[in-house]
Interface confidence: medium
């Protein structure tokens, strides 16, 4: 049987096949993919802008940031208000004070420790 390079198309991930000769073809890949048949998802994480210890997770022609618990937002630049998330973070009447990348407790009546429990 006659071999036709682009029938069926060997290009994957939405790539477009173009016949370049009797037995040769070329794949034009969609943004985010590379390789002779567009088989590879390009790693978009080099020069990522995840901040505050965020980890870059590659996508297709984009990436996302996986943030540590104290940070949120697209690039982990927004502080999580632990005092709102944990109303009882401070014990024994202590006042919760949100800080960039964490929180602290202001203790009263002789109590001490990170959560005023000592």
């Amino acid at each position: 049987s006659l071999y036709v390079p682009c029938a069926p198309s060997p290009c994957v991930n939405g790539g477009t096949c173009r016949q370049t000769g009797d037995f040769t073809f070329e794949c034009n890949c969609l943004p985010g993919f590379e390789g002779s048949t567009c088989e590879r998802n390009i790693d978009d994480c080099p020069n990522h802008r995840c901040q505050n210890g965020g980890v870059c997770v590659d996508g297709v022609n984009t990436y996302n940031c996986r943030c540590p618990p104290q940070w949120t937002g697209q690039f982990c630049t927004e502080d999580v208000d632990e005092c709102l998330l944990q109303p009882n973070a401070c014990q024994n009447g202590g006042t919760c004070a949100n800080r960039n990348g964490g929180y602290g407790c202001v203790c009263v009546n002789g109590w001490s420790g990170d959560d005023c429990s000592e």
């Epitope: 978009d44 020069n47 802008r49 984009t62 630049t77």
Partner: antibody, heavy 117, light 112 residues
Framework: SVEESGGRLVTPGTPLTLTCTVS????????MSWVRQAPGKGLEWIGI??????TLFYASWAKGRFTISKTSTTVDLKITSPTTEDTATYFC??????????????WGPGTLVTVSS | AQVLTQTASSVSAAVGGTVTINCQAS???????LAWYQQKPGQPPKLLMY???TLESGVSSRFKGSGSGTQFTLTISGVQCDDAATYYC?????????????FGGGTKVEIK
């Protein structure tokens, strides 16, 4: 679209701020770079302000000589102490992919800065 | 600082001919994020190609980009008078190791 303004004749040492005004897209999504071109010379990248993180990066030769800042619709380039070598057309250019530096697919017409005593 | 070298500062071609412009990087371009621009006098640069080989929307398929790593090429086939311009390569590099972006010195294409 993007359009530069503020270019004029200045004497050496006189600080000058150029403004790039954008419309039709958000500066919170796209990186913006400044590029210059001296008369009859090639393109020279000055620096970038990144979308989202607002991180600034400058070309090694440009550090301390230029300052980039932005508002919601403008990107400024301050030439801190111009010298005659800073005579050039200054272009504002938008990154072509959201949150990736990559390439520049939208350029302003440029604004001419002439530094002379 | 990262450097992009365009070996020829000018090239000449006949109408209908082929022009090849080379661009060499001093270190690897991030993910082949290498672009080509066309600039005519008094105008800003116009994006032709990005990602080393992806044609920008609306640009003639006579323009073809190839290469990877540190060696890249722009080929113009079936050269037309309108192709007379200066062509620049531009690459993205790791910001952590120096300049994020660099341009080549440009190659002027003249039509015979």
């Amino acid at each position: 679209s993007v359009e530069e303004s503020g270019g004029r004749l200045v004497t050496p040492g006189t600080p000058l701020t150029l403004t790039c005004t954008v419309s039709g897209f958000s500066l919170s999504s796209y990186d913006m770079s400044w590029v210059r071109q001296a008369p009859g010379k090639g393109l020279e990248w000055i620096g970038i302000i990144q979308a989202g993180s607002n991180t600034l990066f400058y070309a090694s030769w440009a550090k301390g000589r230029f300052t980039i800042s932005k508002t919601s619709t403008t990107v400024d380039l301050k030439i801190t102490s111009p010298t005659t070598e800073d005579t050039a057309t200054y272009f504002c250019a938008r990154g072509g992919v959201i949150f990736i530096i990559g390439h520049f697919n939208l350029w302003g017409p440029g604004t001419l800065v002439t530094v002379s005593s | 600082a990262q450097v992009l070298t365009q070996t020829a500062s000018s090239v000449s071609a006949a109408v209908g001919g082929t022009v090849t412009i080379n661009c060499q990087a001093s270190q690897s371009v991030v993910n082949n994020r290498l672009a080509w621009y066309q600039q005519k006098p008094g105008q800003p640069p116009k994006l032709l190609m990005y990602g080393a080989s992806t044609l920008e929307s609306g640009v003639s398929s006579r323009f073809k980009g190839s290469g990877s790593g540190t060696q890249f090429t722009l080929t113009i086939s079936g050269v037309q008078c309108d192709d007379a311009a200066t062509y620049y390569c531009q690459g993205e590099f790791l910001c952590s190791s120096g300049d994020c972006v660099a341009f080549g010195g440009g190659t002027k294409v003249e039509i015979k």
